[in-house]
Every structure is written in C-alpha cells, then in structure tokens.
Interface confidence: medium
C-alpha cells in the first residue's frame, strides 16, 4: 500500500515537520510559525500548543512536536498531557469546590494533591495501632495483641507502651 | 521595488529592552513571513524568529525564547522586534528578512540592518 | 543549538572553481530540501544566492550552483571573480525549535 501511495501521492514524499502545500503543486513547504507536523505526508501543519497563565512551558514547539505544558508552582497537572492545571493544597488538607480544607479526624493525606483517605483500620487485620494517625499521616500497625503474649515469637519487638491511636469506626 | 526599511541605530543600557521595526514596501505585506536575523560585529549570523503578518503567528529561536517579541502592524505594513533584559552580548546589527513566496525556505529581501549597540 | 558547519575560508584564483560544505545532520541539512546560501560582502546585507538546495533566484549569475548528498550541502562558485570575494552563509530548516539555522561562515578569497 505504501509503495502504491507514494507512486500516486507526491504527498507521501513530506517529511514531518513540512506540510502538502497544494497552494504550490503539492510541494512540500516548511511548517508555518507556531505549528508543527509530526508525521510525514500531512496536508497541514497542526497549530502549537500554547502554555499560557496556569501552563508554562515544559518543552518548546518544534517543527515536528508540539509543545509540552506544566503547571507553575502552586498548581499540578492533571488529565493526559496535562490539560489542566489544579491547585496544590498543603499535606493534611484536600481540595473542595470552597478551597483547601483540612482532612476530617480519622483521614489524612500525604501529599499536595488528592483527597483525603482514611486512616487503615489495623484491626481488620488483627494487629494494633503502633504510631497514632494525624492529617498528614496514616496510622502505623504494630504485630496484633496476641503476638505480645509471652513466649510468642514476633518479628516486631514489643513497642513501648503508649496511648491506644484512634482507628476509623 | 520591493524594500524593507528599518528603524536607526539604538545605544542601549545593559537591562534595557530595545524594539527596531522593519517597514514594508513594493509588495503585498500580509503574503509574506518575515525573519528576524542578528550579527554580532564580526561573527555570524544567527537566526532569531519569523513572524506571519498576517495573523500575527510567530516562532522564536529557543536561544530567545522569553527575552524576544515580534509584533506586526498591518495598517502601516511594519513589523517589530523587541528584545528585552539586554546584555552586552546583544551588541549586533539586526537584520528583518522576507520570507520568500509561499513561506519558502529562504529569505529573498533583507533590510539594510539596524545597529544595537548595549553598553553601561 | 550549534551552527551548521562551514570551512572558516576557502581561496581560488580568478576563472577557477571552488567549493564551500555545509554540514549537519539528518535533523536539518539531511532531513530536508530546504537549505539556502547567502553572500554577504563587508558592512551590507546579505543576499540571496541559492534556495531550495540547487534553485537560483533570478538575477543570480548561474556561475552559482548547489547541491545536497546525504547531511552535507555544497556551494559551488566555478569562474571565479574578484567581486565573488565575500563571506559565504548556508542556512536550514531544522526539527528543533530553532526552526532555521545558519552555519558559522566561510571567508571566500581570490587570490
């Protein structure tokens, strides 16, 4: 098929980074300003990603790839390609439609983005709370109470005694 | 006859910004792109960026990106070059070229340079 | 982005041929049928010699001619005159986003 294309198709003969001008027989011409092509035989050149306000720009337009965006800081992104640009929170807070919001006792997060999650429930997997949750961090579980009956063998040395963390209901 | 004129010579302070124009003659302004092009004395030529005057698209060199605009005027058939945050080594004659028909790959009219001297 | 890369001069005798190299990669000069030559005498614009590789725009003496084999172009001037004396540039469109570049020059001499 390719082959045939070529035979019948002056077209096919662009490289990227040129388009098909049928203005001038079907010559290839260079990619206008501000646009690019990234692939060979295109009768246009597809018009450059512009990063502007919350986008800056990753990586340039050339004239065979489309500008890159990112989000300035303060912001990230988010979608494929980074289509759009959300507002950091700080860790133990998540985003409402009200703004950043401080996670809710019993869930926390981590990071700049997302929402807040629950602290893990150390009982379901039959061990205990071993460092307490807070907003910005989950609850660390320790070996389950049965492991610190005497004489059983446990990876986890016994902790120190401490205040029961708080686990989810 | 097809001509391209530009604007005169600029001393410039180091930090400054410094906008040369180029205007149009003999032809039809918004059918052809227009390339800006410097030369430091003595050196090379390097290419700056191109703008469409028709609507207004413009790609810049990546050595320029951020410090260089290129705006045009259709009512007066000008275009411009600005350069901002200068420093000593933007010491060149600028150059405006028209693209050839059709955004061809070359420059076929230049004008007769502007010289930008950046100095404290 | 580096320049294309030109010898820095090239001499000759009057009536005799020379030629100047362009050389780049498969980005730019190789890539592409857009390459062009520029003649540039002391303290005046450049001039168009060459575009397209080999087309010559009217008014340029066919003494001038150019060609491309793989990423190297070449500026060849046969019949040499005194007034070819110049500095000689190649230029090409490129993939990166410095879509045109130019080479470093080539000082041409009669000697």
């Known amino acids: 098929f390719e082959r045939t294309r070529s035979l019948q198709d002056p077209c096919s003969n662009c490289p990227a980074g040129t388009f098909c001008d049928n203005n001038r027989n079907q010559i290839c011409s260079p990619c206008p300003p501000n646009s690019f092509s990234s692939a060979g035989g295109q009768r246009t050149c597809d018009i450059c990603r512009q990063c502007k306000g919350v986008f800056r720009t990753r990586k340039e337009c050339s004239s065979t790839s489309n500008a890159e965006c990112d989000c300035t800081p303060g912001f990230h992104c988010l979608g494929a390609g980074c289509s759009m640009c959300e507002q950091d929170c700080k860790q133990g807070q998540e985003l409402t439609k009200k703004g950043c919001k401080d996670c809710c006792f019993g869930t926390f997060n981590d990071q700049k983005r997302g929402i807040c999650r629950p602290w893990t429930n150390c009982s379901l997997d039959g061990k205990s709370v071993l460092v307490n949750g807070t907003k910005e961090r989950d609850v660390v579980c320790g070996p389950s109470p049965a492991d610190l009956s005497p004489g059983a063998s446990s990876v986890t040395p016994p902790a120190p005694a401490r205040e029961p963390g708080h686990s989810p209901q | 006859e097809v001509q391209l004129v530009q604007s005169g010579a600029e001393v410039k302070k180091p930090g400054a910004s410094v906008k040369v124009s180029c205007k149009a003659s003999?032809?039809?302004?918004?059918?052809?792109?227009t390339h800006w092009v410097r030369q430091a004395p003595g050196q090379g030529l390097e290419w700056m960026g191109i703008?469409?005057?028709?609507?207004?698209?413009?790609s810049y060199a990546q050595k320029f990106q951020g410090r260089v605009t290129m705006t045009r005027d259709t009512s007066t058939s000008t275009v411009y070059m600005e350069l901002s945050s200068l420093r000593s080594e933007d010491t060149a004659v600028y150059y405006c070229a028209r693209g050839a028909p059709e955004y061809s790959s070359s420059s076929d009219y230049w004008g007769q340079g502007t010289m930008v001297t950046v100095s404290s | 982005q580096s320049a294309l890369t030109q010898p820095a001069s090239v001499s000759g005798s009057p009536g005799q041929s020379i030629t100047i190299s362009c050389t780049g990669t498969?980005?730019?000069?190789?890539?592409?049928?857009?390459v062009s030559w520029y003649q540039q005498h002391p303290g005046k614009a450049p001039k168009l010699m060459i575009y397209?590789?080999?087309k010559r725009p009217s008014g340029v003496s066919t003494r001038f001619s150019g060609s491309k084999s793989g990423n190297t172009a070449s500026l060849t001037i046969s019949g040499l005159q005194a007034e070819d004396e110049a500095d000689y540039y190649c230029?090409?469109?490129?993939?990166?986003?410095?879509?045109?570049?130019f080479g470093g020059g080539t000082k041409v001499t009669v000697l």
């Open positions: 230029n090409s469109y490129t993939t990166s986003s410095t879509r045109w570049m």
């Open positions: 498969s980005s730019d000069v190789g890539g592409y049928n857009f």
């Open positions: 703008i469409n005057p028709s609507g207004g698209s413009t």
């Open positions: 003999g032809y039809t302004f918004t059918s052809y792109y």
């Open positions: 397209d590789v080999s």
